[in-house]
């Protein structure tokens, strides 16, 4: 990825930004992401083992969309979380979360998206991840399932 | 809360931004938008025949919401796409997409929204559009159905 | 449309930003928000009686998510609004709104989110609020229900 310049401060610096898209070879949590091909962006932020690693403290808008679908609805509870991990806290911190229950008609083919987005004060070395409850129900098309952020 | 510095450009320049709202005389795809009245914004970006035309290469946050509703649910599959067209690609590029299937109880009055938003590296002369699968099921209230972007 | 200047500061100034999270002692409309503890942000914007008060005219990205859930679905219509009030207009202005009808199977435990986010030109002294139709169906976890903005 080439870096993208942010508006014109004295020295041209990389705009901290990421847009990662669904990767269908995710086998476990957290989700893994495509960080190289397609409509992907990665500049001034690092991608490491499913996570976006912050390298400059500041305010970030963080977002994610997950597209769930299935052949035959059984209304399994769905959850979609963006969470943060760092060395200072033993526990993961859930930043944003969406849950769905009783969302389709039993037996029918179904599809539904969950979108999350908000502003957070992130610290250098924070790691951000996305978790879902039912990996087998996620569709990983690049336009449908994604994870991103940018520094304000 | 500690304060966070905003970016420091020397010269006052137009912020590239758009927020267009639903226009009920949309008769075909892509959707048409209100670009003049109400809570509309259009600055440093051109609106032309349904599309937002980029005139400066850079990083943009692009978003859209569509409000679908009907008098009697028959669970027609719904889709909501933000796509891009330019001279370099013969094909439209779907940037973001939401799909819904089996989302309401047959025969009942129903309503549902789809929200999309993400960061993209756009090039001068790219044109962005919004497409839906079922035009007759879209409600075009300005607070409910909209399309916008801003340059980071 | 008049063009909107992007931020010009020579001096490092507070980034105008807010991220407020759900507060379970909300008893009436508009919703009340947690403005002190947890993953809350409040800088260069004031929180007053459920509302975010703008103190500098300009372009803002405004967002909110509300998490609705219930023990036994009866498909009460749900609405989620971000609206604006100021001294110049007698009427509230609905900026963004989401509605849901016929969204779950009668009698079942259910859960659903509504997300809104867009850009608006706000004026100093504008007050922004969030309204929902069914307060008793809102879950106020900080990761699930929130309200925020930042100045572009």
């Amino acid at each position: 990825q080439i870096g993208h310049p942010s508006p014109p401060p004295e020295k041209k610096e990389l705009r901290k930004v990421a847009h990662l898209t669904g990767k269908s070879n995710s086998r476990s949590m957290p989700l893994e992401w495509e960080d190289t091909y397609g409509i992907v962006l990665l500049s001034g932020v690092k991608y490491k083992k499913g996570g976006l690693v912050i390298n400059e403290t500041g305010l970030y808008f963080v977002y994610s969309k997950v597209y769930f679908r299935g052949q035959s609805c059984n209304n399994l509870p769905l959850s979609h979380k963006v969470y943060m991990r760092n060395s200072k806290y033993p526990q993961d911190l859930v930043m944003m979360e969406g849950k769905m229950m009783s969302y389709c008609t039993t037996g029918q083919m179904w599809a539904r998206s969950s979108y999350l987005g908000a502003v957070f004060n992130l610290t250098s070395a924070d790691h951000l991840y996305v978790n879902v409850s039912e990996l087998s129900l996620v569709n990983f098309e690049e336009s449908q399932t994604f994870f991103g952020l940018y520094k304000l | 809360q500690i304060g966070h510095p905003s970016p420091p450009p020397e010269k006052k320049e137009l912020r590239k931004v758009a927020h267009l709202t639903g226009k009920s005389n949309s008769r075909s795809m892509p959707l048409e938008w209100e670009d003049t009245y109400g809570i509309v914004l259009l600055s440093g970006v051109k609106y032309k025949k349904g599309g937002l035309v980029i005139n400066e290469t850079g990083l943009y946050f692009v978003y859209s919401k569509v409000y679908f509703r009907g008098q009697s649910c028959n669970n027609l599959p719904l889709s909501h796409k933000v796509y891009m067209r330019n001279s370099k690609y013969p094909q439209d590029l779907v940037m973001m997409e939401g799909k819904m299937m089996s989302y309401c109880t047959t025969g009942q009055m129903w309503a549902r929204s789809s929200y999309l938003g993400a960061v993209f590296n756009l090039t001068s002369a790219d044109h962005l559009y919004v497409n839906v699968s079922e035009l007759s099921l879209v409600n075009f209230e300005e607070s409910q159905t909209f399309f916008g972007l801003y340059k980071l | 449309q008049i063009g909107h200047p992007s931020p010009p500061p020579e001096k490092k100034e507070l980034r105008k930003v807010a991220h407020l999270t759900g507060k379970s002692n909300s008893r009436s409309m508009p919703l009340e928000w947690e403005d002190t503890y947890g993953i809350v942000l409040l800088s260069g914007v004031k929180y007053k009686k459920g509302g975010l008060v703008i103190n500098e005219t300009g372009l803002y990205f405004v967002y909110s998510k509300v998490y609705f859930r219930g023990q036994s679905c009866n498909n009460l219509p749900l609405s989620h609004k971000v609206y604006m009030r100021n001294s110049k207009y007698p009427q509230d202005l609905v900026m963004m709104e989401g509605k849901m009808m016929s969204y779950c199977t009668t009698g079942q435990m259910w859960a659903r989110s509504s997300y809104l986010g867009a850009v608006f030109n706000l004026t100093s002294a504008d007050h922004l609020y969030v309204n929902v139709s069914e307060l008793s169906l809102v879950n106020f976890e900080e990761s699930q229900t929130f309200f925020g903005l930042y100045k572009l």
Epitope: - | S28, K46, K49, G50, I54, N55, R85, N86, H127 | -
Partner: antibody
């Protein structure tokens, strides 16, 4: 006025660049410069337009790929055509239209392209 | 997007009236983005009507455009010999797509 040039007799498979030159004015804001063609004894067929404000380009679905419209200067618009076939034999017109609605106000006299072996 | 001019040729006497129809496969932009052109042999087309019903400058008021959405009509009244020509409709659509109708020849007797 507008004037087209570059029309010629060419062999199938060849490429050609047509030029549209404005005299007495330059392409003004809010207008598109377009190419339209007309095969002998046939109707008009829209090919492509370019927005004079930002060089955004718009093509007929059948024209994508083989036809390229560009604006090298404020008074010149080009149309490049590749892999020419006999079906491309036509008079090629350039015309200006308002960007917000179709109104091809000003037309050039046309330039003839003949594709034959 | 397909524009269909149902009649390939119409004829009428001097002083009479002719009506030319143009049907679009989908609604034109803002329901009125349709124009009409007159073309004579070995000449480029000339704009007559734009936005469905607005008369282009210098065009006599004998030419009248009407219609909305997908159905449009050009009416030429008080027909003159000089009106003998081929008439084309053109539609503008969202995404800045244009299309021409197949043309209708007007023969003045």
């Amino acid at each position: 006025s507008l004037e087209e040039s570059g029309g010629d007799l060419v062999k199938p498979g060849a490429s050609l660049t047509l030029t549209c030159t404005a005299s007495g004015f330059s392409f003004s804001s809010g207008y598109d410069m377009c190419w339209v063609r007309q095969a002998p004894g046939k109707g008009l067929e829209w090919i492509a337009c370019i927005d004079t404000d930002n060089d955004a380009t718009y093509y007929a679905s059948w024209a994508k790929g083989r036809f390229t419209i560009s604006k090298p200067s404020s008074t010149t618009v080009l149309l490049q055509i590749t892999s020419l076939t006999a079906a491309d034999t036509a008079t090629y017109f350039c015309a200006t239209t308002h960007g917000d609605y179709v109104a091809f106000k000003l037309w050039g006299p046309g330039t003839l392209v003949t594709v034959s072996s | 997007q397909v524009l269909t001019q149902t009649a390939s040729s119409v004829s009428a006497a001097v002083g009479g009236t002719v009506t030319i129809n143009c049907q679009s496969s989908q609604s034109v932009y803002k329901n009125n983005d349709l124009s009409w052109y007159q073309q004579k042999p070995r000449q480029p087309p000339k704009l007559l009507i734009y936005q469905a019903s607005k008369l282009a400058s210098g065009v006599p008021s004998r030419f009248k455009g009407s219609g909305s959405g997908t159905q449009f009509t050009l009416t030429i009244g008080d027909l003159e010999c000089d009106d003998g020509a081929t008439y084309y409709c053109a539609g503008g659509y969202t995404a800045s797509i244009y299309a021409f109708g197949g043309g209708t020849e007007v023969v003045v007797k």
